[in-house]
Structures are given as structure tokens and as C-alpha cells.
Interface confidence: low
């Protein structure tokens, strides 16, 4: 039938309000209505090649590319993007069509390009081509700065390929540790691209434009410093430049420095040395190891040796793609109402992450601090003792990471009551989750001690806004209690709270709250 295409390609645009993570999925998120991408047979192509209409996506938007295959029998498939094979799990819809989906979350430039889907059915093979681009090519970009050696000069150039052209500055510090914090008087800033004074303790280059500020630190091994307890580690992606500086100070110039990679001397053209006299006529030598574009075989232990100092090493790891390593298992905490507490996530990531803390659909700024062992930590303390679900979300150019936390605040129950013609209900959000009792107040029991067990139904429900639990108890009306006062009480380890309800009274129900500690 000519009217029923064998293949249908659709684009689904997602509302970006969730932080779920994934790449290729058979069950994409609920979202907008699908947009037909046509999927016309490509003329003059060997084999059956369908081409979907070009897809333009806003930066940070989330989409699903979906193919519906109207072919009998089972199908198998494979996605290919930038020469990498991606997992593909077809499933079948209610009309028994094969459905293959590719979810792209938070679109970035690295995710733009051609997505090829190879489908094999019992009858024939197809190839479907999707071209995905970022909608407005005139995007601001802010790329992390990197270093280059200035031609024929002992100087470093700092480059950030960003639009609009960023202001590039060198941030130099000559003292140790805490005093090298950004706003410290020990910090000197130079708004220029080329740096000749390469002897400082701490050298960073920062680029800033309308999008913000990105910095790169010149990785340094200082032979005069006590080595870290854990070996320093430097991550780079294939194709990025590698720069390591080895620095040593000695009483005179009678010493030399050398670089080795896995016990083999670095080749000429991959290092250069500089030296200068310092205070008390001591001599500073620095030796740079550099590779303009790293490959996998540049991975290994780089050791700087001196004839007058103990050697020190750094582990350089070259990765194909960036990563975020952290445990993503959810964590539950319960604290007292005035207890000081911070959520924290320890992670190892490259390139540096951008992160947010989210609570009740509100995002909070995220700070990260580097630890000595190569890990970083992000803490969130601004929870204001509000119970519920807290989400840490981190991403870099290549990876995304989400971790959930639940915060429970230990407190005595607070009871709210409501009643209808047929039942009375009480609600409480205390923690730990309270237990319930219902009591009847009568002539026989003026203190409401007569317990009601019949017709009581307890449940806990998630109050979605905060992700906190609310416990409720419902009493179904019976002839035995009509017209009586009843009392519902919620109790936990921190106390008890009660509400008294007059059943079957016309008009608004009078509620009398009792607080019993």
C-alpha cells in the first residue's frame, strides 16, 4: 500500500524539566506531540537509505529521534554516531509496529551531527539518516583555555576558542595553599594572552565572556614540595594539548632536570627548559613537558628527575570521552530540626563539571572543591531543614550524572482533619512516620478513651512537591459513632498530636486540636 510508508520517522521534543539521564532508549520520556520527519527514500544511493528531514534543536533541549517500522516479524537495529556504535533496543507499539528511539538529553554541540540507524527486518535491510544540528548557529561559546608554546620564544600563549572573543587573563600566585585563593593579595592578574614569567608557584589562565569564566591551571610538579600522599593525576581527552611543568629550586645552578615517560626520556621537541636566579642567588629551573595533541599512547607515568632532588611523578590518563565518576545510589538522611547538616557528593570528573542542586523544582548554585586525592567534592547546606528530595545534577561536555538524596526531619506529628458525610480523615507529616489511633468520646468515655478499631484505614502518600511523606488515617462512618465526637491521634517517638471531630454535624465541622507531647 503506497499510502502506508514502511518507515516513519518522528521527532519528539521534550519539556526540559527532568534530569533523567540516558542516551539510547526504547521508552522515551512523556512529552510533546511527535513531529513527522518525512523519511524519504534517498535517490541514487546504494541500498535502501531513508533520509529524515534535518532536525534543528535548541541548545540544552532534549529530544527523541524515533523510527516506526511497519514490517512483519522481528527487527534488529544499530545506531551509529561519529563512528561509535550505540545500543539499540527496538520494541513494538499497540499497532505492532517496531519502534526504535534515540534520546538526546540536554543538546550540546558534541551531540550534533549525523545519526545513522541500521535496521534489519526479516524482509529487508534499511538505513535511516538523521542530521541533528543546533538551531541557532550564532551561539556564544566559552571553551576552557589551553596552552601553546609561543613560536621561537620561551613563553606560553593562552588560547580560548570562544565567541565572542573572550578576555584572557593569567592569574599568578607566588605563595602556597590558601593564600592563592582568587581574591588574595598574593594573586596577580595579567590581562594578556602571552606569559613570559613562567616561574611562579601557581599559574592559571582564565577566559571570560558573556557566558562566564573558565580557567585552566598549569599542572605543576614542585620538587621542593613534599609529594602528595596519593599520586597526582591529570586527565586529558584525545587531541587535547598536554602541559606539565616541573619546577625545582636549588642553592646554585649545578643541577639539571629531566622528564621521563614510563622510564623513557621524552623526545626532543616535547620539552623545553628555562632557568632564572631567585632570592639569595638560588636558581630556579623549570622544565616543561608538552604534547600538542595527545593520543592514547601518551598515557602513563611522567616522572621529573633532578640531580639534586627526589624524583616525583604524575599519572597522565588519556580518555576518549569525558567522564563523571561517583556513586549514584540514592542516600537517605534523617536529622533533628536544628541539627547542622550538609549533603555532599564526592566525584572524579573530566572535563570539570557544571552542577546544580535542586529541591522542589528550584535550583541552587553548586560549588565544588578539589581534594588532594584527585577527587572533588560538592556540598549543599542550604536546605533550611526542609524535608524532601534533593537532587544533585552534574554534567560536562560528555557525561551527565544525577544523584538523589532524601532528607527527613525528625519531628512530632502535626494533625489536620477533614470530614464528609461518610467519613473522617486525619493527615500528618511528622517524622518518623506516625502511627494512628481513633477514639470515641461518649458519656461512658468523656476523656475519649474508648478506642475505635473498626472502619479505620491508614496509608502513607508521597507529597510530590517536596518528595516528603504524609501519613493519613480515614475512619468510615458507622451508625455506632454517628453524632459522637471522635479523636484521631498521630504519634511517633517524638510525641503525639490529636484532633477532635464531631461526626455528622451540619455545616463546617468543628475541629479541636490537642497537642500531647
Amino acid at each position: 500500500n503506497q499510502d502506508l510508508p514502511v518507515i516513519k520517522c518522528v521527532l519528539i521534543n521534550h519539556k526540559n524539566n527532568d534530569s533523567s539521564v540516558g542516551k539510547s532508549s526504547s521508552y522515551p520520556m512523556v512529552s510533546e506531540s511527535p513531529e513527522d520527519l518525512g523519511c524519504a527514500l534517498r535517490p541514487q544511493s546504494s541500498g535502501t537509505v531513508y533520509e529524515a528531514a534535518a532536525v534543528e534543536v535548541d541548545v540544552s533541549a532534549s529530544i527523541t529521534l524515533q523510527v516506526l517500522v511497519d514490517a512483519p516479524g522481528n527487527i534488529s537495529c544499530l545506531w551509529v554516531f561519529k563512528h561509535s556504535s550505540l545500543n539499540c533496543q527496538p520494541h513494538f507499539d499497540l499497532q505492532n509496529r517496531g519502534v526504535v528511539s534515540m534520546v538526546i538529553l540536554k543538546m550540546t554541540e558534541t551531540q550534533a551531527g549525523e545519526y545513522l540507524l541500521f535496521i534489519q527486518s526479516e524482509a529487508t535491510n534499511y538505513t535511516i539518516l538523521f542530521t541533528v544540528s543546533i538551531r541557532n548557529t550564532l551561539l556564544y561559546t566559552l571553551r576552557r583555555p589551553y596552552f601553546r608554546k609561543m613560536e621561537n620564544q620561551d613563553a606560553l600563549v593562552c588560547i580560548s576558542e570562544s565567541v565572542p572573543e573572550p578576555i584572557v587573563e593569567w592569574v599568578l600566585c607566588d605563595s602556597q595553599g590558601e593564600s592563592c585563593k582568587e581574591e588574595s593579595p598574593a594573586v596577580v592578574k595579567k590581562e594578556e594572552k602571552v606569559l613570559h614569567e613562567l616561574f611562579g608557584t601557581d599559574i592559571r589562565c582564565c577566559a571570560r565572556n558573556e557566558l562566564g569564566r573558565e580557567c585552566t591551571r598549569l599542572f605543576t610538579i614542585d620538587l621542593n614540595q613534599t609529594p602528595q600522599t596519593t599520586l597526582p593525576q591529570l586527565f586529558l581527552k584525545v587531541g587535547e594539548p598536554l602541559w606539565i611543568r616541573c619546577k625545582a629550586v636549588h642553592v646554585n645552578h649545578g643541577f639539571g632536570l629531566t622528564w621521563e615517560l614510563e622510564n623513557k626520556a621524552l623526545e626532543e621537541g616535547n620539552y623545553f627548559e628555562m632557568s632564572t636566579y631567585s632570592t639569595n642567588r638560588t636558581m630556579i629551573r623549570i622544565l616543561f613537558a608538552f604534547v600538542s595533541s595527545v593520543a592514547r599512547n601518551d598515557t602513563g607515568y611522567y616522572t621529573c628527575s633532578s640531580s639534586k632532588h627526589p624524583s616525583q611523578s604524575a599519572l597522565v590518563t588519556i580518555v576518549e570521552k569525558g567522564f563523571i565518576n561517583a556513586t549514584n545510589s540514592s542516600e537517605d538522611y534523617e536529622i533533628d530540626q536544628y541539627e547542622e547538616f550538609c549533603f555532599s557528593v564526592r566525584f572524579k570528573a573530566y572535563p570539570q563539571i557544571r552542577c546544580t542542586w535542586t529541591f522542589s523544582r528550584k535550583s541552587f548554585p553548586c560549588e565544588q572543591k578539589g581534594l588532594d586525592n584527585g577527587y572533588s567534592i560538592s556540598k549543599f547546606c542550604n536546605h533550611k531543614h526542609q524535608p524532601g528530595e534533593y537532587i544533585f545534577h552534574a554534567e560536562n561536555d560528555d557525561a551527565q550524572f544525577t544523584k538523589m538524596f532524601t532528607l527527613n526531619i525528625r519531628r512530632k506529628p502535626q494533625v489536620l482533619a477533614e470530614a464528609s458525610a461518610s467519613q473522617a480523615s486525619c493527615f500528618s507529616d511528622g517524622y518518623p512516620l506516625p502511627s494512628w489511633t481513633w477514639k470515641k468520646c461518649s458519656d461512658k468515655s468523656p476523656n475519649c478513651t474508648e478506642e475505635i478499631t473498626e472502619g479505620v484505614w491508614n496509608r502513607k502518600a508521597n507529597r510530590k512537591v517536596f518528595g516528603q511523606w504524609v501519613s493519613s488515617s480515614t475512619l468510615n462512618m458507622s451508625e455506632a459513632i454517628k453524632g459522637f465526637l471522635v479523636k484521631c491521634c498521630a504519634y511517633n517517638s517524638l510525641g503525639t498530636s490529636c484532633e477532635t471531630i464531631l461526626l455528622n454535624s451540619p455545616g463546617p465541622f468543628p475541629f479541636i486540636q490537642d497537642n500531647i507531647s
Epitope: 554541540e109 544540528s133 543546533i134 541557532n136 548557529t137 550564532l138 551561539l139 556564544y140 561559546t141 588560547i159 580560548s160 576558542e161 570562544s162 565567541v163 565572542p164 572573543e165 565572556n209 558573556e210
Partner: antibody, heavy 119, light 112 residues
Amino acid sequence: QVQLVQSGAEVKKPGASVKVSCKASGYTFTSYYLHWVRQAPGQGLEWIGVINPSGGSTTYAQRFQGRVTMTRDTSTSTVYMELSSLRSEDTAVYYCARGIGYGGYFDYWGQGTLVTVSS
Amino acid sequence: DIVMTQSPLSLPVTPGEPASISCRSSQSLLHSNGYNYLDWYLQKPGQSPQLLIYAASSLQSGVPDRFSGSGSGTDFTLKISRVEAEDVGVYYCMQGLRTPHTFGGGTKVEIK
């Protein structure tokens, strides 16, 4: 210093194509957009499109869509603008200009290339 | 497309006297970042255009400070405090908020 040097004048017949080059120097080629603007004799300026040398993505004015192709060669820091199916009303001076960011003000311009379309 | 309308079409000036050119856009050029995406260019006879003012009021480096730009939203003005003989040429405003970027029709400044 920043320079944009364009290729020389061209005379073309209607229906033909023309490819104008613009060689950039004196700055990081991939850090700036390069726009193409034309000016018919005695007329005002008309924006044709833009290329991002970092990645090669392009945006064209609707009226040139399908006829214009902008490309770049990062090894030579050169951008190219090819206009096909030429008509007499395409006779104009074609300028390349360096754009600063999204708002794209043009701080440096090439010297211009006169393209004459005549049978 | 955003339509840019310039006035006057022609402006005869006396050297040493001030001059003013108006530019109006069919949509506001004020971006949420606070910038007005409106630039002014001068094209001297036989030359390529050159940037004078960007973001409505920022003077491009190297441009004499007798040139100034003002305005916001849809109405913009270029002023020359004291016209000099070298200021003759055609002045264009251009919007960079949306693609396609569009230019005003130009104002020809000539010495009386």
C-alpha cells in the same frame, strides 16, 4: 594586525556560479564568525549569511537559501562563499566581515570583490 | 525580518557643525542581557564599510570621540558633534538581534 583579504573581481554569465574567498589573518580564525554582505551598484548593504569557522555551521538569509554555500578551510584560515544560478541582479560587490559574537557587529571588513553577471 | 528605517536619506552638513541621523527598527532590539543589538557603520566613497558604534552606544576603538550613539528599543540616533570633511560617506545602521541581520537604507552625508 587583523586582515581579511578577498579574491579578485569576477565576470560571470547568468546561470553560472561564482566562488569568492576571504583569507583571514592576525587573529584566531576559529574564534570569530565570518559574515558575507553584498552591495549592488549604488545600493545599500544586504546580509547574505554567516559561517562559524569553528565547526563550519552556517546560517543564510532566506532569500539566498539553496543558492549560497559557505565553507571554510581552517588550515589556510580562509572562508569561501559560493553563489550559484547567478542572475544579473546578483551583480554587486561582495564583502566578508568578521563578526563579534551572536549580535555580530562587524569590526573588520574585507576589501570587497566585484562580481559582474552579464551575458 | 526586522525592517530598519533610516532618516534622513541625505544630510548636507557644514564642517564644524553637529549632525544627527535617526534609525528606527520594526521590533525592539533590546536583548534580555541589556544590550541593544544596533550598530552604526560608515562607508566612505570607494571603501569598505567601517564600524563606528556597536551595541547602540559603544564607540569602537580607533573611532574619533566626536561620534556617539544613543537610543534603546526601536529608536536610535547617531550624532557627530563637529563634522569634519573626512566624515563624508554613507552611514548605515544594522540590527544584529535576529538573523537575517538587516541594514537601514543609508544616510548620505555630504559637505554643503
